[in-house]
Amino acid sequence: PEPPTACREKQYLINSQCCSLCQPGQKLVSDCTEFTETECLPCGESEFLDTWNRETHCHQHKYCDPNLGLRVQQKGTSETDTICTCEEGWHCTSEACESCVLHRSCSPGFGVKQIATGVSDTICEPCPVGFFSNVSSAFEKCHPWTSCETKDLVVQQAGTNKTDVVCGPQDRLRA
């Protein structure tokens, strides 16, 4: 019979013969022959192959380097790579998450609009009129000024974006 020029899905052409690819999680040991099937071997510990393949070596799992602030989010298998994420209080510097940086804090006068996650930094916003923040924080929102009226007090010192109002007693009219 004529040697094939193309093979079926998940096969490859070698020496005028269609051989089966190795399934994910296995590497190629030897090509098929007229008499034998493709020989594949499972990847070793800490190795993987995530496609149908004819690779003779498996890939090493990604190392989540703690010195770069990384930790394992999902342990790799023979068919998948390890997924890294950042330690608590840190976030990835890129989408590929190859290293981490400390979450940004919002300065006094600014509050947290969105708390940081493992993949995104803190988003800060200026405290609007009627609100303040007197701390540098990665968690604190702007707080509303104290309402002196509800405490039967009067404003003695106006609030700013960094300080609360100061309330004091109302002046009593003497007879």
Partner: nanobody
């Protein structure tokens, strides 16, 4: 949940060029491979090109090798397919696909992809 939105398709003369884009949202981009597939009327969906995240390794179908180029821009969460020297037989609906996290290698089979876009029509007139 992952959303993929293709754009850049259209009608072009044979020998012309188009650049397809696929914007990904709702996922952490840059940790898994992406690919392009196409389906012509009355034909099976076929692999076109793929790009992995380990060193940006690429794979191409023999029919497009040397004419098409796949690339990614992690900053804008987009994968591109630059198509040059287009032929009438390139006419098809082009769909982008993404593998799940932990699958960094460029893959050529449909069942190795986890998320799919709706597709964009490319028509090449002779």
């Amino acid at each position: 949940q992952v959303q993929l939105q293709e754009s850049g398709g259209g009608l072009v003369q044979a020998g012309g060029s188009l650049r397809l884009s696929c914007a990904a949202s709702g996922r952490t981009f840059g940790r898994s491979a992406m690919g392009w597939f196409r389906q012509a009327p009355g034909k099976e969906r076929e692999f076109v090109a793929a790009i992995g995240t380990r060193g940006g390794s690429t794979k191409y179908a023999d029919s497009v090798k040397g004419r098409f180029t796949i690339s990614t821009d992690n900053a804008s969460n987009t994968v591109y397919l630059q198509m040059d020297s287009l032929k009438p037989e390139d006419t098809a609906v082009y769909r982008c696909a993404v593998r799940g996290p932990g699958y960094p290698s460029a893959a050529i089979f449909q069942d190795e992809y986890h998320y799919w876009g709706q597709g964009t029509q490319v028509t090449v007139s002779s």
